[in-house]
């Protein structure tokens, strides 16, 4: 039962986001799973480090992992993802996944390489009339059918707002996308659903835009979100849209 | 040098009881605390655990409604109430702390309270 | 359950005493044995059925896997005057053998 003799996949994830690790195992009997562990071998010769255990319905997140590491499969179900939230560089390496079934000596075991990205900007800049892209992508092994995907804004002197909907109703395999309000005919979505990625481009940016955006992307019972603040500057044709830490040079009138 | 420090004998009336186990010298949300009755006809006893980091619990099926297992972190104290006490518990309680050896099938008792 | 045997008894300095365990069902080497000397707690021996604790002298060993585990003393010693549980960790509700008193 051990696929670590595979290539594992491979997971890219921003520093804070958040990551979901498959251990999903076919079994043709009926054995339920009796315990899980979850490991981190970090590499470069650092020591192996123990994320989470679970064993008669306990599971326990142990260290520097407490608050961050949840069990997110059907554990009934021969399922014991693991999602890892507000990733830190220090959480880069190999996941091992270890099941056993009860009565059982043989050991199923998955391994899941994460690579840890700096911090994505979370302010983004963009001029009046401009286009921009908000991204918004969870970060997964495994293949989840996304249910719903919303951006709402708040801004400074508007109510939240819902800029965008995206529903996938799979009882009635009936899929439809809509943004709203003031949004309206300004936003598409421009991610990849079918990866996870609620990503979306606004364009003809009005100076009310500016605030905060948040995403949230529904797989089943389980939301990733993540918050964007847009800033809006007057209106300037000469420079790119580009995040505020990358902010461009404003030349001055007289200079080319 | 790495202590549980339990509280000490009590003689009290038929109702309720709470015994404390202050655990020194180490983390204590990362180990989980198990608690042991000990008998001269039943012998060691398991009576279930508590994880003060998580704040799960198990216990064993024998105890339930007999004994309750809190924790509080800020003191480092892992706690057992015992309730509609009778002569039978009258007896020795342990606390002990499990250690981690490999995986979650290799858990032991490495240091236990005096009792 | 765990049946451990004998419940009793009594070796001289320098003998090797055997003391055994049997599960019930297969615990798949998830077995500790522990010494327990009159008044104190009781003390981590070997883990894993065949792992020897820090610190204890080597003339302690276990052996055994399935249901049937054994405690072997090399060379008994007046300090090793004790009772000895077994404990499988397999499962809840952790269990203990009935305990061995090992007397001089």
């Known amino acids: 039962l051990n696929d670590l003799n595979v290539s594992p996949p491979e997971l890219t994830v921003h520093v804070g986001d958040s990551a979901l690790m498959g251990c999903v195992f076919q079994s043709t009997e009926d054995k339920c799973i009796f315990k899980i562990d979850w490991t981190l071998s970090p590499g470069e010769h650092a020591k192996d480090e123990y994320v989470l255990y679970y064993y008669s319905n306990l599971s326990v997140p142990i260290g520097r992992f407490q608050n961050r590491v949840h069990l997110m499969g059907d554990i009934l179900c021969n399922d014991g993802s693991l999602l890892l939230q507000d990733v830190q560089e220090a959480d880069q390496g190999t996941y091992i996944c270890e099941i056993r079934l009860k009565g059982e000596s043989q050991v199923f075991k998955k391994a899941v390489v994460l690579h840890v990205l700096p911090e994505e900007p979370k302010e983004l800049m963009v001029h009046v009339g401009g286009l921009i892209q908000m991204g918004c992508v969870f970060q997964s092994t495994e293949v989840k059918h996304v249910t719903k995907v919303e951006w709402i804004f708040s801004g400074r002197r508007a109510k939240e707002e819902i800029v965008f909907r995206y529903y996938h109703k799979l009882r009635m395999s009936v899929e439809y996308s809509q943004s709203w309000g003031h949004f309206q005919n300004r936003v598409n979505l421009v991610g990849d659903i079918f990866r996870n990625d609620g990503s979306i481009m606004l364009q003809g940016v009005r100076e009310s835009d500016g605030g905060n955006y948040t995403c949230s992307i529904h797989l089943g019972n389980l939301v990733f979100k993540k918050t964007i603040v847009l800033h809006v500057s007057p209106e300037e044709p000469r420079t790119l849209v580009t995040p505020a830490a990358l902010r461009p040079l404003v030349l001055g009138g007289n200079q080319l | 040098d790495v202590q549980l420090v339990e509280s000490g004998a009590e003689l009290v009336r038929p109702g309720a009881s709470k015994l404390s186990c202050k655990a020194l010298?180490?983390?204590?949300?990362?180990?989980?605390m198990h608690w042991v009755k000990q008998t001269p006809v039943h012998g060691l006893e398991w009576i279930g655990i508590?994880?003060?980091?998580?704040?799960?619990?198990v216990y064993n099926q024998k105890f339930k409604g007999k004994a309750t297992l809190t924790a509080d972190k800020s003191s480092s104290t892992a706690y057992m109430e015992l309730s509609s006490l009778t002569s039978e518990d009258s007896t020795v309680y342990y606390c002990t702390r499990r250690r981690y050896y490999g995986s979650s099938y290799n858990w032991y008792f490495d240091v236990w309270g005096a009792g | 359950v765990l049946t451990q045997s004998p419940a009793s008894l009594a070796a001289s300095v320098g003998e090797t005493v055997t003391i055994t365990c049997r599960a019930s069902?297969?615990?798949?080497?998830?077995l500790a044995w522990y010494q327990q000397k009159q008044g104190k707690s009781p003390q981590l021996l070997i883990y894993?059925?065949?792992s020897l604790e820090d610190g204890v002298p080597s003339r302690f060993s276990g052996s055994g896997s399935g249901t049937q585990y054994s405690l072997k003393i090399n060379s008994m010693q007046p300090e090793d005057t004790a009772t000895y549980f077994c404990e499988q960790t397999y499962d809840v509700p952790l269990t203990f053998g009935a305990g061995t008193k090992l007397e001089l």
């Open positions: 069902e297969n615990i798949y080497y998830s």
């Open positions: 508590i994880h003060p980091g998580s704040g799960g619990t």
């Open positions: 010298a180490y983390t204590f949300t990362d180990y989980e």
């Open positions: 894993n059925a065949n």
